[in-house]
């Protein structure tokens, strides 16, 4: 806590300018009016204050706004944002996307800090949902943002926002997250024609159910192996050999290299060997002709 001392004669700040960098901490505290600072926050960023000096400026704002800063101040915090704690940020009410962008810019190039995570959380909660413009902004700064959300948080993403999602934004999503995002993507893209639809939906297919994979197999989509390997195992198991062949098109030959990995391995175990042989890939492990199929739950218990 900086001691309250009188401002030396002639040092009272009339405006926020470069002369203040020569002020000692106690002089800043005594000579800079908090209200002046609040109205001229946009100038702070252009002045090379030390970290200690920024601490004093933050302290002055905290005293002026004990319930949390107004958005007019928040928007111009600049590097002072890095001094904020998550507790400080929880007091804010940020509604403007411009404010969010300005603060994310300060943290650009760094990992998402607890401060940024809190800011985003406050902003999204304030808006009530993760709309397209917000998602556009967040994924531009943090491509992994979407996959950092819990399935519960993702459920607030409206289907219209899905248009903002790029394939790389989903790279680190796990199956539970894709389970939530896929139906939204399906709804968002369903007005497109078949081939355009597949291009858009492809990166979300890790959450697709069996029936949609079967429908895609009727569309000559030629799914690549990387996409196929990310599909839900339970969704792939009911696909017939003919359906997988149609789904993958020329990429079907890649099954051989993946025959020991999920979901290919488990899918092979559910197919008749005669059917697998029609692919001519030498896939082994299917059900011999005339054999009963054990229910999968029994197979699990036996292995």
């Amino acid at each position: 806590e900086v001691e309250k001392t009188a401002c030396p004669s002639g040092k009272k700040a009339r405006e926020i300018d470069e002369s203040l960098i020569f002020y000692k901490k106690w002089e800043l505290e005594a000579c800079v009016d908090a209200a002046l600072l609040a109205t001229q926050m946009d100038r702070v960023n252009a002045i090379p204050f030390t970290y200690e000096q920024l601490d004093v400026l933050k302290h002055k704002l905290d005293e002026l706004y004990p319930q949390g800063y107004p958005e007019s101040v928040i928007q111009h915090l600049g590097y002072l944002f890095l001094k904020m704690s998550p507790e400080d940020i929880r007091k804010w009410n940020v509604t403007s996307l411009e404010t969010l962008k300005a603060l994310l810019e300060v943290n650009k190039g760094h990992e998402m800090s607890p401060q940024v995570a809190t800011l985003i959380d406050r902003f999204v909660k304030g808006r009530g949902q993760l709309d397209k413009d917000t998602l556009d902004t967040l994924t531009a700064f943090y491509p992994g943002y979407l996959c950092s959300l819990s399935p519960e948080e993702l459920s607030s993403v409206p289907p219209s926002s899905i248009w903002a999602v790029r394939p790389q934004d989903l790279d680190t999503c796990d199956p539970r997250q894709l389970d939530v995002l896929y139906p939204k993507a399906r709804l968002a893209f369903q007005n497109m024609n078949g081939s355009e639809y597949f291009v858009k939906i492809q990166s979300f297919l890790g959450g697709a159910p069996t029936e949609d994979l079967k429908a895609l197999s009727q569309q000559n989509v030629s799914m690549d192996l990387a996409t196929f390997m990310k599909l839900r195992t339970d969704a792939v198991l009911p696909l017939t050999v003919a359906e997988v062949q149609k789904l993958l098109g020329p990429h079907v030959e890649g099954l051989k290299a993946e025959e020991r990995h999920r979901p290919v391995r488990d899918w092979i175990l559910r197919q008749r060997q005669d059917d697998l042989d029609t692919l001519g890939l030498g896939l082994q492990g299917g059900i011999p002709n005339g054999y009963l199929v054990l229910d999968l739950s029994m197979q699990e218990a036996l292995s």
Epitope: Q190, G194, E211, D212, K214, A215, L216, L237, P238
Partner: antibody
């Protein structure tokens, strides 16, 4: 919400024709495969016909092949079943149903109409 | 065409009892077998898709199993609202077909 409403049923003499309609709302009709399923009074379900989202492929049960024609008008969100050369055994409640998936004919969904009764009798 | 045979045709069960309905296909259909429930004067409702996948919103007491030619629908702890006719349905090959139905009555 999804709604399917059948109409066009009634009493008709053997050998005559009838056209059933199904008005769809609450979903993007042009993206879904559609089906007709029937149920004779006190009997089980019988799949009758299916059509792709764009009308490019049509499938029929053996019992109606050559007599019934399934069609759709995506601009009007309508599904149709033209039934010619009707027989007594065609007497049933006819349901229209949406496919569960988009861009294919894969599996009957949870969305069915309430049905329209067709009675073929002299 | 593929013929589906359900058994039993009729079952009278007391509430909380476990119900098992089987469906046998005349040829191999993989997992392309679905179960529907039809209550009197209502259109059918999808319960289980692809032999064992629960459809959204369906109570957890309904489960399905099987693959190939033999399939089972199980209702654990039957409730009064489960009184209905249950149909198995195959979408493995055209023409699609249904089983003849199993009527479940509450004692």
């Amino acid at each position: 919400q999804v709604q399917l409403v059948e109409s066009g049923g009634g009493v008709v003499q053997p050998g005559r024709s009838l056209r059933l309609s199904c008005a769809a709302s609450g979903f993007t009709f042009s993206s879904y495969g559609m089906h007709w399923v029937r149920q004779a009074p006190g009997k089980g379900l019988e799949w009758v016909a299916a059509i792709w989202y764009d009308g490019s492929n049509k499938y029929y049960a053996d019992s109606v092949k050559g007599r019934f024609t399934i069609s759709r008008d995506n601009s009007k969100n309508m599904l149709y079943l033209q039934m010619n050369s009707l027989r007594a055994e065609d007497t049933a409640v006819y349901y229209c149903a949406r496919d569960l998936s988009i861009f294919g004919v894969v599996i009957l969904s949870d969305y069915w109409g309430q049905g329209t009764l067709v009675t073929v009798s002299s | 065409e593929i013929v589906l045979t359900q058994s039993p045709d009729f079952q009278s069960v007391t509430p909380k009892e476990k119900v098992t309905i089987t469906c046998r296909a005349s040829q191999y259909i993989g997992s392309n077998l679905h179960w529907y429930q039809q209550t009197p004067d209502q259109s059918p409702k999808l319960l289980i898709k692809y032999a064992s996948q629960s459809f959204s919103g369906v109570p957890s007491r309904f489960s399905g199993s099987g693959s190939g030619t033999d399939f089972t629908l199980t209702i654990n702890s039957l409730e009064a609202e489960d009184a209905a006719t249950y149909y198995c349905h195959q979408s493995s090959s055209l023409p699609w077909t249904f089983g003849q139905g199993t009527k479940v009555e509450i004692k």
